[in-house]
């Protein structure tokens, strides 16, 4: 066990052009506070993943009012260290998030308003017991200067706070198998202390605070015999007595998650999903209120009305979960219509529309004939990514505004001559052909392929196409 300590030295405009505006004004005085979130390992964890190593919130800084016309100076800081206690071993490598929050002190309805000014994150290696490490991080136009260290709480010592030390019982030497505790040579390593309540018969530990079970026993304290009545979902070695596989203890057996947390197995261990108001590796840390800054990603915290709703996070768009810790896959709701491609930009959703569609959600069909006039008696036809007009005879073009040459397509077959006419075209057929397009040969016996020529027309006369 031990404590991670963070000392904020300054928060103000970074070097270079574009100095940020002061977050406070005479009309809206404000004060700063800081939140730190620690996670084990060097993995690139998302900002919304839980602070598995712990989190802490600073006190509020002095009230600050901007001097009119003055550039934003380094802002007045809260007193004291931010301290994040850790119960288990210090991991040596860790990720951190430090958030700078502004508390506005104007006459807001419902008390002070909070807003996130800057967030910095990083991954570091750090041995417990070492000196203060100094750091500078930039977030936009702001610069944060800070120092940090990890120190062990007695009786733990070592770079991971896993060795335990006790005062020597005898002045000359330590007990059998126990070494002196460097640098505290007057103390001796203590035997490992397993998790409180760990069964002395069926449990053992290799790290302090641990409780690992011998085969055939399970539960957080190794007090629950493994059932041999069922051979389903084997996990352990074969049992000679039952002839089937006895499940060895799984990480979630006996549910290590306290306070109603639900356990899920991970490749290396287990993960607890904690109910509102609890956090920590095993949901063992309780009594969280808004003062602890439990809302991630700029969520607004309001006090709940009972212990099971100790605080309520009102999440900004794009986040959900009781702590606003989960990023919403807003594209999973398929907001883009008509086959548009959804892009979640974090701060906003964007739809990339297919050809022929437009609008924030691709809801407007550009083929839509509404408001599209086809001239000269043409009719609008939807489709193909652009509206199309089916034009009346004698007209063409996209909107039927162009007068068409009906003879341009050479509609008269078999060498017939085409004449443009006010209501269409007329074909004058070559000898031996007849029909509106001169498409029918006249038979040598004088009968035509048509049953009869229309009254008043002799075969070979120009046929008017109506």
């Amino acid at each position: 066990a031990g404590v991670f300590e963070l000392q904020i030295h300054s928060f103000g405009p970074g070097p270079g052009p574009g100095a940020p505006r002061s977050p406070c004004s005479a009309r809206l005085p404000c004060r700063l506070f800081f939140r730190v979130c620690l996670k084990p390992g060097l993995s690139e964890e998302a900002a919304e993943s839980p602070c598995a190593l712990g989190a802490a919130l600073s006190a509020r800084g002095p009230v600050y009012t901007e001097q009119p016309g003055a550039p934003a100076p380094d802002l007045p800081l809260p007193d004291g260290l931010l301290q994040v206690p850790f119960r288990d071993a210090w991991p040596g490598t860790f990720s951190f998030i430090i958030e700078t929050w502004r508390e506005e002190l104007g006459d807001q309805i419902g008390g002070p308003a909070w807003s996130l000014l800057a967030r910095v994150a990083g991954r570091r290696r750090l041995a417990a017991g070492g000196p203060w490490a100094r750091d500078i991080q930039r977030a936009g136009a702001w610069e944060l200067r800070f120092s940090y260290r990890a120190r062990c709480e007695p009786p733990a010592v070592g770079t991971a706070c896993t060795r335990l030390c006790r005062p020597r019982s005898a002045p000359s030497r330590c007990g059998p198998g126990l070494r002196p505790c460097a640098p505290l040579e007057d103390e001796c390593e203590a035997p490992l202390v397993c998790r409180a309540g760990c069964s002395p018969e069926h449990g053992f530990c290799e790290q302090p605070g641990e409780c690992r079970c011998l085969e055939g026993w399970t539960g957080p304290l190794c007090t629950v015999p493994v059932s041999t009545s069922s051979c389903l979902s084997p996990r352990g070695p074969s049992s000679a007595t039952t002839g089937c596989l006895v499940p060895g203890p799984g990480p979630c057996d006996g549910n290590p998650c306290a306070n109603g947390g639900s356990c899920s197995e991970t490749p290396r261990s287990f993960e607890c999903t904690c109910p509102r108001g609890f956090y920590g590796l095993r949901c063992e840390v309780s009594g969280v209120t808004c003062a602890d800054g439990p809302c991630f990603n700029g969520g607004l915290c309001v006090g709940g009305a009972d212990p099971d709703s100790a605080y309520i996070c009102h999440c900004p768009p794009g986040f959900q979960g009781s702590n606003c810790e989960k990023r919403v896959d807003r594209c999973s709701l398929q907001p883009c219509r008509n086959g548009g491609l959804c892009l979640d930009l974090g701060h906003a959703l964007r739809c990339r529309c297919r050809a022929g569609f437009a609008g924030p959600r691709c809801e407007h069909d550009l083929d839509d004939c509404a408001g599209r006039a086809c001239a000269n008696g043409g009719t609008c036809v939807e489709g193909g990514g652009a509206h199309r007009c089916s034009c009346a005879l004698g007209f063409g073009g996209r909107d039927c505004r162009e007068r068409a040459d009906p003879c341009a397509a050479r509609p008269c077959a078999h060498g017939g001559r085409c004449y443009a006419h006010f209501s269409g075209l007329v074909c004058a057929c070559a000898p031996g052909y007849m029909g509106a397009r001169c498409e029918f040969p006249v038979h040598p016996d004088g009968a035509s392929a048509l049953p009869a020529a229309p009254p008043g027309l002799r075969p070979g006369d120009p046929q008017r196409y109506l």
Epitope: G260, T289, G303, G304, A305, D308, S309, A310
Partner: antibody, heavy 117, light 109 residues
Framework: EVQLVETGGGLVQPKGSLKLSCAVS????????MNWVRQAPGKGLEWVAR??????????YYADSVKDRFTISRDDSQSMLYLQMNNLKIEDTAMYYC????????WGQGTLVTVSA | QAVVTQESALTTSPGETVTLTCRSS?????????ANWIQEKPDHLFTGLIG???NRAPGVPARFSGSLIGDKAALTITGAQTEDEAIYFC?????????FGGGTKLTVL
Amino acid sequence: EVQLVETGGGLVQPKGSLKLSCAVSAFTFTTYAMNWVRQAPGKGLEWVARIRNKSNNYHTYYADSVKDRFTISRDDSQSMLYLQMNNLKIEDTAMYYCVFYYDYVYWGQGTLVTVSA
Amino acid sequence: QAVVTQESALTTSPGETVTLTCRSSTGAVTTSNYANWIQEKPDHLFTGLIGGTNNRAPGVPARFSGSLIGDKAALTITGAQTEDEAIYFCGLWYSNHLVFGGGTKLTVL
């Protein structure tokens, strides 16, 4: 809008039993702890019982005055809250309210229980 | 068992500011008591005003505010109106048990 509708009140003799129900709508019932609160005629409010949600193992809590006589329960699938009252006493006469605490307090309209010989 | 104490009655005038308080027998009221304020009007009409010490319910006028003053929870009505005449109960949570105060009868003359 959150709605809590209590039913099941009535006239009962001392040592008798009664079961109150509360139908809940317009919020995710399964997520929250639920409570019964009562108000005797001309008196103040008295908290009676509380039942937590499934992730808190449906733990129940009771006021000393009703312990071992009243049982609070819930049916998450129906969004229903219940109060089984046994061995009723004259001092249990009151208006009974189904109450839900979240960001503030939500009340039902109440159901009257009268214990009289 | 904790006892929660409120003023039995208070009188104010329209437009005045009045503060109702809620004291715990176990010591200072803290945010961990999730102080709640409830208004009762005739015919058993209850309205939750404030939850979690200072969280005003939607639809409740801005003149109602909750806070901690010293070692007590407080409900302040800034600019009381005649329609604010009612009985006000405070409730405090002690772990999973809820204890109500006896109520304050507020008269707005």
